[in-house]
């Protein structure tokens, strides 16, 4: 029979015009319609009938154009594995999960399956910012010049050293990567250990 404009149509080379929305059915040697996201195959096609689709039942989904005879069961985000929900399951999309705050994805199989606590960054360092939160463990980098971080923490950020002059004070001790600048009132005497040294 002659190829038709719409499925089902005969295909001698086992390929279909629209790979996303059609599939090759080898038993009948035809191209048939796939079912749209949120639906499944209720009745398979034949030479004279196209696929019949039905809506996924509650708590199930199919994400793509498909020729599945069932919908996938929605699964909750497992808090024991360190996951939390960011978007609920719909007929067209599975539950969207991410690692809980302070955790990173330690096991990945198409999606994150297990999260672990982020490593602490020691004083004088901070976690390097990543494109996607929870994607990997912390990579600690030194605070850049003029900044400090004085705790062991997975999330603390390096802060700029205090500028004493902005507060009408003078510097008593310079800041380091692990501590802030120490300021003092300009009228106060130098501490004993600093007498005789010139503060720059």
């Amino acid at each position: 029979s002659q190829p038709q404009a719409v499925p089902p149509y005969a295909s001698e080379n086992q390929t279909c015009r629209d790979q996303e929305k059609e599939y090759y059915e080898p038993q009948h040697r035809i191209c048939c319609s796939r079912c749209p996201p949120g639906t499944y195959v209720s009745a398979k096609c034949s030479r004279i009938r196209d696929t019949v689709c039905a809506t996924c039942a509650e708590n199930s989904y199919n994400e793509h154009w498909n020729y599945l005879t069932i919908c996938q069961l929605c699964r909750p985000c497992d808090p024991v594995m360190g996951l939390e929900e960011i978007a609920p399951c719909t007929s067209k999309r599975k539950t969207q999960c991410r690692c809980q705050p302070g955790m990173f994805c330690a096991a990945w199989a198409l999606e994150c399956t297990h999260c672990e606590l982020l490593s602490d960054c020691p004083p004088g360092t901070e976690a390097e910012l990543k494109d996607e939160v929870g994607k990997g463990n912390n990579h600690c980098v030194p605070c850049k010049a003029g900044h400090f971080q004085n705790t062991s923490s997975p999330s603390a950020r390096c802060q700029p050293h205090t500028r004493c002059e902005n507060q009408g004070l003078v510097e008593a001790a310079p800041g380091t990567a692990q501590s802030d600048t120490t300021c003092k009132n300009p009228l106060e005497p130098l501490p004993p250990e600093m007498s005789g040294t010139m503060l720059m």
Partner: antibody
């Protein structure tokens, strides 16, 4: 044992609508395609179309503009409406089950048929 | 649409004889998509053969089907009195589904 029974008026006036119902007993209407076929007196068989239990339909292009199928799963029934009838629509109307697993689309169980005459 | 032409129009045979009924299609029909039906007066058709050669449930083995492409045959190896009826072929390879005009098998 699945059985089919057609029902509806035996006479319809020209230009009016022919309405028939097929009742399925001894089994569920669900998960099957169902079909209507007609046979004018002393002539051959003409396929009218399919309906799936979910309501999906396929019609013979020659009748598509005049025909409507519907299904009522709660009553285990499916129905045919053919509008603007003429004398050429006089026929025995059969409902049947479509065998889609082994025979793909052959009709394995038939009703006994109901004669419909179009006459004023 | 595919036109199915059955021959002969009428076949006159005696019980015990062999009947050969022909169905020719206007274009090629996949052998999985051809069926044969038997119809007795005042009754609905009954499915005999589907897929050109597979017997439907409860059909005696004296009925057999064969053929491919455009030529198909229904054979009744040894006619019984209850076999005298009208026989239709049907294709469901291409929409719309079509039937042959029928072969009347009558007692000689």
């Amino acid at each position: 044992q699945v059985q089919l029974q057609e029902s509806g008026p035996g006479v319809v006036k020209p230009s009016e609508t022919l309405s028939l119902t097929c009742t399925v007993s001894g089994g569920s209407i669900s998960s099957y395609f169902w079909t209507w076929i007609r046979q004018p007196p002393g002539k051959g068989l003409e396929w009218i179309g399919y309906i799936y239990y979910s309501g999906s339909t396929n019609y013979n292009p020659s009748l598509k503009s005049r025909v409507t199928f519907s299904v009522d799963t709660s009553k285990n029934q499916f129905s045919l409406k053919l509008n603007s009838v003429t004398a050429a629509d006089t026929a025995v109307y059969y409902c049947a089950r479509v065998e889609t697993i082994m025979a793909f689309d052959a009709f394995d169980i038939w009703g006994q048929g109901t004669m419909v005459t179009v006459s004023s | 649409e595919i036109v199915l032409t059955q021959s002969p129009g009428t076949l006159s045979l005696s019980p015990g004889e062999r009947a050969t009924l022909s169905c020719r299609a206007s274009q090629s029909v996949g052998s999985s998509y051809l069926a044969w039906y038997q119809q007795k007066p005042g009754q609905a058709p009954r499915l005999l053969i589907y897929g050109a050669s597979s017997r439907a449930t409860g059909i005696p083995d004296r009925f057999s089907g064969s053929g491919s492409g455009t030529d198909f045959t229904l054979t009744i190896s040894r006619l019984e009195p209850e076999d005298f009826a009208v026989y239709f072929c049907q294709q469901y390879d291409t929409s719309p589904i079509t039937f042959g005009q029928g072969t009347r098998l009558e007692i000689k």
